[in-house]
Amino acid sequence: WDPVALKLPERNTPRNSHCHLSNSPRAIEHAYQYGGTANSRQEFEHLKGDFGAKSQFSIRLRTRSSHGMIFYVSDQEENDFMTLFLAHGRLVYMFNVGHKKLKIRSQEKYNDGLWHDVIFIRERSSGRLVIDGLRVLEESLPPTEATWKIKGPIYLGGVAPGKAVKNVQINSIYSFSGCLSNLQLNGASITSASQTFSVTPCFEGPMETGTYFSTEGGYVVLDESFNIGLKFEIAFEVRPRSSSGTLVHGHSVNGEYLNVHMKNGQVIVKVNNGIRDFSTSVTPKQSLCDGRWHRITVIRDSNVVQLDVDSEVNHVVGPLNPKPIDHREPVFVGGVPESLLTPRLAPSKPFTGCIRHFVIDGHPVSFSKAALVSGAVSINSCPAA
């Protein structure tokens, strides 16, 4: 399967008619939040305009991180590259000139939680870093005959696993935590990300611990040490901002699956154990969309499935599989790639809202150690209102 390429819309959508909380919490327009996972990022593939000889990038930045990647682009082998990152709270702009590296480092620290305008310019073997329109830092290296062969994507907020290690100090290759806005190349806005991993709108207002799944869609793929076999117990708390959406999905190559989702406020568990589909559901007396936290537990004991929603419970007994097979399979939380949905599993909306205290078989699951966070998912913080 391929991670779904998710784009973030620019306007807040209206309040969900069934939900106490708006499905788009208050956020800064055109600003996106990065961090929470090591490789939180947006990727921009097809850029208008060439930046071979001369380029001027500009961006707005707000962070409290001391270290982390803000911008990175390179050729395939990462011999030619350009990067902006944080080191000890200072901004570092770097690119190569032939085999040498030109590095410009700010004297001031900019991890003060305030917005800063940053312009980074490359003109062949010269570089300029302009911060807040006031401080201009400039460096040059002797020119070379080598041509600069940069190839997309531009990585914003972080890089793909394994990238940038060759050129950037280890504690700055991981995603920075904070917000970016208004990325421009040579005065033209760069808006449509081809892929998004753990990036949400830049929310305003109080935040609390949890993993937030934004309306734009996304999902978490759990680390492979977690898998759902013949017997398991999954428990988690949800505070939805929409009355429908995928909560948990596990799928094996031979078509067996577990799917937990909400549909119009009802929680449904569907299972296929290699014989046929079977399902159970709970319609809570208290709406899950009331702005409070609700606890959901799914227990599978071979062909018996139990669903608990708060204090309400239901069961289904499926057919016995005479030769049950225990698979290791990826577990998706908050959404599922469409390529994995079988005809029997109608395409389901991704979940919108917050999930916390996710536990499998008594072991707390850290989403920050997930195998993949795709789309508009904020790992460690949820808008509280």
């Epitope: 017997k231 398991f232 227990i299 139990q306 419970v313 499998i360």
Partner: antibody, heavy 119, light 113 residues
């Protein structure tokens, strides 16, 4: 404390049916699965099936599907197992057993009802 | 159905002796998700229902003396009594707790010399 009360013995004729009872006390009856187990003298136990009093969900051992019918009466916190078309092969001790919860073991057993099928 | 095979069918021992009995299942009882083996050992004395000694193959039920130890994984399991006492004379059953239908072994009867 948890108690599962079962009649000590039942004597029935071949071909007849019998309804064995198991009255639960000392815990919330509707919260836990109740299982039934058969044990013939000198043999290992055999699992018949399980029922959840709240949802009414039942999971049978295929071997006993046409023999046993599990039901509950929530108002009296009693589980029942009806055995039909009795033969001498059905003569055994029948236990009702409470399960701690799904994925866990049996935590309480009744004392068992000795069923004798004889003319 | 998973078939549980116990051996030996009976054991004659003297007090203080170490005893081991075996239980084999026709399919693995190891759950890959939580890496637990769903095998339970019971002790049954005459006229009484079975009593849980060990669950998850090696976890001792509270109140069970530590001379009882469960071990093994997958399809091969062992119950060991480090020093048999007179009150340990009983029939010991292993049970597949992994998949339905739940199945029991035929038992190992522990007798005193």
């Amino acid at each position: 404390q948890v108690q599962l009360q079962q009649p000590g013995a039942e004597l029935v004729k071949p071909g007849a049916s019998v309804k064995l009872s198991c009255k639960a006390s000392g815990y919330t009856f509707t919260t836990y699965w109740m299982h039934w187990v058969k044990q013939r003298p000198g043999q290992g136990p055999e699992w018949i099936g399980m029922i959840h009093p709240y949802s009414g969900a039942i999971n049978y051992n295929e071997k006993f599907k046409s023999k046993a019918t599990l039901t509950v009466d929530k108002s009296s916190s009693t589980a029942y197992m009806q055995l039909s078309s009795l033969t001498s092969e059905d003569s055994a001790v029948y236990y009702c057993v409470k399960q701690l919860r799904l994925l866990y073991y049996f935590d309480y057993w009744g004392q068992g009802t000795t069923l004798t099928v004889s003319s | 159905d998973i078939v549980m095979t116990q051996s030996p069918s009976s054991l004659t021992v003297t007090a203080g002796e170490k005893v081991t009995m075996s239980c084999k299942s026709s399919q693995s009882l190891l759950n890959s998700g939580n890496q637990k083996n769903y095998l339970t050992w019971y002790q049954q004395k005459p006229g009484q229902p079975p009593k849980v000694l060990i669950y998850w193959a090696s976890t001792r039920e509270s109140g069970v003396p530590d001379r009882f130890t469960g071990s093994g994984s997958g399809t091969d399991f062992t119950l060991t009594i480090s020093s048999v006492q007179a009150e340990d004379l009983a029939v010991y059953y292993c049970q597949n707790d992994y998949s339905y239908p739940l199945t029991f072994g035929a038992g190992t009867k522990l007798e005193l010399k």
